[in-house]
């Protein structure tokens, strides 16, 4: 599990690559509040 925006699916990365898009470090994080601590 990852909630700090470091995670992006390979599928999304692949789609962006094939479409000529640029993968940036601003992926939307999963919802922090739905995780306990």
């Amino acid at each position: 599990a990852c909630d700090t925006a470091t995670c992006v699916t390979h599928r999304l990365a692949g789609l962006l690559s094939r479409s000529g898009g640029v993968v940036k470090n601003n992926f939307v994080p999963t919802n922090v509040g739905s995780k306990a601590f």
């Epitope: 599990a1 990852c2 909630d3 700090t4 994080p29 922090v32 509040g33 306990a36 601590f37």
Partner: antibody, heavy 115, light 108 residues
């Protein structure tokens, strides 16, 4: 094994500042946000805020804005909390806690503010 | 901010007894944002239940959680001596995240 090792107890004078640390090990530091929680002696838990170590993004409880500053150091997998303009009301145990449903908390840092 | 009101504040139970602690929220929240913690005297808190009903790793099956909207509960099926602790609910629906004021569980 995941561990959160917090710095030792602090005795500081009113008006001073203090910076406490929370060293993480056993997991990828940048993959979980780190929460900070305050507990006064004999009282309940109060959420201060969290830091995202990946990009140093923070979210604060409005009550602690201007009092607490959260930072992190990816190279040492350490989260920090600095508390400023200390008063007796800041005397408490402060915990860091890793987000993720797996229940990892530091052992707590006891802060005593006294002249 | 969302205020979480726990009931009772303190209670004493006999070993084997069934215990229910309630947590009432001042605004409706989705169950995925409601968590329960246990804090034994002198120790850090630990998560018991996450997302209202999911048992955290290593937590005995006698603990369970339920609820929705503004009303949530934590149940201990059969009280044991090691369950003496303070229990807190916590919401992550809106910032600031907030905790209930705690329920102190003692043994008779």
């Amino acid at each position: 094994e995941v561990q959160l090792q917090q710095s030792g107890p602090e005795l500081v004078k009113p008006g001073a500042s203090v910076k406490m640390s929370c060293k993480a090990s056993g997991y990828t530091f940048t993959r979980s946000v780190m929460h900070w929680v305050k507990q006064k002696p004999g009282q309940g838990l109060e959420w201060i805020g969290y830091i995202n170590p990946y990009n140093d993004g923070t979210k604060y409880n409005e009550k602690f804005k201007g009092k607490a500053t959260l930072t992190s150091d990816k190279s040492s997998s350490t989260a920090y909390m600095e508390l400023s303009s200390l008063t007796s009301e800041d005397s408490a145990v402060y915990y860091c806690a890793k987000s993720g449903n797996d229940g990892y908390w530091g052992q707590g840092t006891t802060l005593t503010v006294s002249s | 901010e969302i205020v979480l009101t726990q009931s009772p504040t303190t209670m004493a139970a006999s070993p084997g007894e069934k215990i229910t602690i309630t947590c009432s929220a001042s605004s409706s929240i989705s169950s995925i944002y409601l968590h329960w913690y246990q804090q034994k005297p002198g120790f850090s808190p630990k998560v018991l239940i996450y997302r209202a009903k999911n048992l955290a790793s290593g937590v005995p099956a006698r603990f369970s959680g339920s609820g929705s909207g503004t009303s949530y509960s934590l149940t201990i099926g059969t009280m044991e001596a090691e369950d003496v602790a303070t229990y807190y609910c916590q919401q992550g629906s809106t910032i600031p995240f907030t905790f209930g004021s705690g329920t102190k569980l003692e043994i008779k």
